[in-house]
């Protein structure tokens, strides 16, 4: 049967019809609609938006649209007891206090329920002590402090600048260093691009702007009280002391005006080098404590936030497949925001809305996709990817048997320079082929393909004439699908020029200034970049759901496996003596990669030649492609991270946002020279090589002829 049995439109025309139906003006209208009030997870406003989206998706023509609710642990500031940080004098008097809220943007002065800046899931506490400036609070920053500078953070309050790594990793590192509190701040060096004005006159962060965000270290667990299982009506919940990933010390975020007041008095050691200096007019002294005149002054934190089990709502829409209804292609993005969500997430949610509308239009004309498409509006992403993870936990048996692919749809833009794609290697060829068919929205590339502008602006570091595609890390809703369940996943958005803009993320990320006007005035007035992202995300979903043979190329996995094996081997070879002493060999891994390469090549040849009119053989070949990603899952998970089960990729242990290849081996090798028991440490390296080699070999065998 052809994938187009429900319609007489030709396959090529289907894709064209779908893409032509996507309109920039609609995305603009949807973004405006989604950003007029805050939609914080667990609030009535976000529940109402869930019901609105459910209703509109039904109107658009989906077969069914349901709400899936869960009761999960969330965190909120105390409305009557605000969080703040003080400088106190020797008598305990507060001589300076950090701000209680951000100055509201023009036009939003009278909006209620703007949550003040806070670090979600911070415990309560009022620690006081000397400050230590810890740069970005990365692993290497604490190494520099403790090992080189001999500065002890134990019992100190540390102040760290946002950027470079996920904030939860910063807090974890500070905890491990013995700190009793953490202050996070946005330095203009990272959140103020030169030559651009502050909001509302430009897209830069004003001094009173603050980045909100959760500070969990969940490692893929989802709801902290119900790891591994859905937070449903009959869930057994852990006690708060046993909850997964909660920080143990108070944490609070501030803007750079407030940071200036804390940092300008710092004494103690000078910064170790220029990489520790930001752009404020302060010395960036490390401390501990304040300089001479102010040495009796201390810093005191006042944190009164509470953790509360709260109901959240996902919206799940279904467009049933005509030929393979038991094969699921999922497009999902979150709906909850910290405040207005002008970029995060509503620039993504507006695109999903328009994609649903376009698919619905085709369906109303009699068309159906070959495979089932599921659309998801996730809740509580900002609180630790909770909505997506709980739904995946509830539906894990279906997903692991039927999940073809997951396409993520958070923020559509983080800049307006070029495309950015992170995905499984299985999708490389799909992305290349699709972007060659789409028009570039970029100035100077009129009449050229998106592939061309993307390749020119963001070239692959390895392959000339190809664009850069990055590894999947985490920090977004694809995590459970890819890292836990082994469902092929990808994400795409428009990004900044990383060469010229070295600030982290976009300046107004998670602040009150992330408004509709920010997007409409400064990032994408014509919504042409949003439209392009809609075409990429929607086009990927269309192809994955409709192509007769799944658009996965297993040969691309072979190429990256060799690259990753080379990389991890070279890291290990920094210790040639130990490798010799402990008989560490990578032969098994390289052999497995070689076998994978040969088997993948043969599979691809068979894929070209088989009889596509034979539905049983077609299904068999497609299942081998679908289950290849699944074959990289180790049911036991990574050491101390049971929900990160993918052997080839995991979020970096030092930065949740970044992907690490062969993470088990990488972590076993990390800082191995400092381990107290080298024999045990190198034994673990050998065990991880064994696990990786076995997994690659086992995955290869899933591509072999079945009998």
């Amino acid at each position: 049967k052809s994938s187009n049995e429900a319609t007489n439109i030709t396959p090529k025309h289907n894709m064209k019809a779908f893409l032509d139906e996507l309109k920039a003006e609609n995305i603009k209208k949807f973004l405006y609609n989604f950003t007029q009030i805050p939609h914080l997870a667990g609030t009535e406003q976000n529940f109402q938006l869930a019901k609105q989206i459910q209703s509109q998706w039904k109107e658009f023509g989906l077969d069914s649209v349901e709400l899936a609710h869960y009761d999960v642990l969330l965190s909120y500031p105390n409305k009557t007891h605000p969080n703040y940080i003080s400088i106190i004098n020797e008598d305990g008097n507060e001589i300076f206090n950090t701000s209680l809220f951000e100055p509201p943007p023009p036009g939003y002065e009278n909006v209620s329920d703007i949550v003040p800046p806070f670090s979600a899931f911070s415990p309560q506490g009022m620690p006081e002590g000397d400050l230590v400036y810890v740069n970005y609070a990365r692993t290497e920053d604490f190494f520099k402090l403790e090992r080189d500078m001999k500065i002890n953070c134990s019992g100190k309050i540390v102040i760290a600048r946002y950027g470079k790594v996920f904030r939860g990793n910063k807090v974890k590192n500070a905890q491990l260093a013995g700190a009793k509190g953490v202050i996070l701040y946005s330095d203009p060096a990272d959140y103020f691009a030169p030559g651009v004005k502050s909001y509302p006159d430009g897209w830069n962060l004003p001094g009173g702007g603050v980045q909100r965000g959760n500070i969990l270290n969940l490692n893929g667990a989802g709801d902290p009280l119900t790891p591994g299982y859905p937070a449903n009506e009959y869930a057994y919940r852990r006690g708060i002391a046993e909850a997964v990933g909660l920080p143990s010390i108070p944490v609070h975020p501030i803007g750079y005006y407030d940071a200036q007041k804390l940092l300008e008095k710092m004494g103690g050691s000078a910064p170790p080098d220029s990489s520790w200096r930001g752009s404020l007019k302060v010395p960036y002294n490390v401390g501990p404590g304040f300089t001479g005149n102010f040495s009796t002054q201390k810093v005191k934190m006042h944190i009164h936030s509470t953790n509360e089990v709260t109901r959240i709502y996902n919206v799940i829409g279904t467009l049933r497949g005509a030929v393979e209804p038991d094969r699921y292609v999922i497009l999902g993005g979150h709906r909850d925001s910290w405040v207005f969500g002008g970029i995060d997430p509503q620039s993504g949610a507006a695109v999903v809305h328009e994609i649903v509308r376009s698919f619905g239009t085709l369906k109303k004309e009699g068309w159906r996709p070959r495979r089932t498409i599921l659309f998801a509006s996730w809740d509580a992403e900002e609180f630790g990817l909770l909505g997506s993870t709980e739904w995946a936990e509830e539906n894990s048996r279906l997903l692991q048997e039927r999940g073809v692919a997951y396409i993520n749809a958070d923020s559509s833009i983080e800049g307006n320079y070029t495309l950015r794609v992170d995905c499984t290697p299985l999708m490389y060829s799909l992305v290349h082929n699709l972007t060659k068919e789409l028009k570039s929205p970029d100035e100077g590339f009129e009449g050229k393909s998106l592939y061309e502008s993307w390749t020119k602006k963001s070239p692959s570091p390895e392959f000339s004439g190809m664009p850069r595609i990055s590894k999947l890390g985490s920090g977004n809703d694809f995590e459970v699908f890819f890292q836990r369940l082994g469902i092929a996943s990808g994400r795409a958005r428009y990004t900044k020029n990383w060469e010229t803009n070295k600030f982290s993320g976009y300046p107004l990320y998670h602040s009150v200034y992330e408004t509709y006007e920010l997007v409409e005035k400064f990032y994408d007035p014509m919504f042409k970049y949003h439209l392009t992202v809609a075409q990429v995300r929607g086009g990927m979903v269309f192809e994955l759901a409709n192509s007769i043979v799944l658009p996965f190329d297993c040969r691309d996995y072979a190429v990256v496996l060799r690259k990753y094996a080379d990389k991890i081997y070279s890291i290990s070879m920094k210790h040639p003596q130990e490798m010799k002493t402990y008989s560490v060999s990578f032969d098994s891994l390289f052999s497995a990669v070689k076998n994978f390469t040969e088997i993948a090549s043969k599979f691809s040849e068979r894929l070209q030649d088989f009889d596509k009119s034979n539905p049983i053989v077609l299904r068999m070949m497609n299942d081998q492609l679908m289950f290849l990603e699944r074959a990289f899952i180790d049911p036991l998970g990574l050491p101390d991270r049971p929900f990160y089960r993918h052997v080839i990729y995991a979020p970096s242990s030092h930065n949740k946002y970044a992907g690490e290849s062969f993470p088990g081996i990488y972590d076993a090798l990390f800082d191995i020279e400092s381990k107290v028991d080298p024999s045990k440490a190198w034994g673990e390296v050998k065990r991880q090589i064994y696990v990786a080699a076995f997994t690659v070999q086992a995955a290869a065998e899933t591509l072999s002829e079945v009998a």
Epitope: L100, P103, P104, G207, G208
Partner: nanobody, 127 residues
């Protein structure tokens, strides 16, 4: 357009109290630090007090510390200066003024560059 209108001045005996008000309009009152400054007859402008945009910080000139209290009411878009234990040297025209930078407020430095100021209200302390 930005408007700042002071009121509450008058003649008062030494040791007594007075409360000045400043009605703000034409801008986001919740977003700006607000100052009181004064000009005594024949003298230059003197900074008196500042309150942060969110009300969390208040700073005072040494000459008024412990006697004057600055406050703000967001529901009324109004800035106040409660003046107790008034002295003859407090005689001046009192102006409320807006900090030019959104979200900034910390101290008196740069008060001479305050971007908007009212027309002032005269306080005369005399027996």
């Amino acid at each position: 357009q930005v408007q700042l209108v002071e009121s509450g001045g008058g003649v008062v005996q030494p040791g007594r109290s007075l409360r000045l008000s400043c009605a703000a309009s034409g801008f986001s009152f919740r977003s700006y630090g607000m100052h009181w400054v004064r000009q005594a007859p024949g003298k230059g402008l003197e900074w008196v007090a500042v309150i942060s945009y969110d009300g969390s910080n208040k700073y005072y000139a040494d000459s008024v510390k412990g006697r004057f209290t600055i406050s703000r009411d967001y529901s009324k878009n109004t800035l106040y200066l409660q003046m107790n234990s008034l002295r003859a040297e407090d005689t001046a025209v009192y102006y409320c003024a807006r900090e030019p930078r959104i979200g900034y407020y910390y101290d008196s430095s740069g008060y001479d560059s305050l971007d908007y100021r009212g027309q002032g209200t005269l306080v005369t302390v005399s027996s």
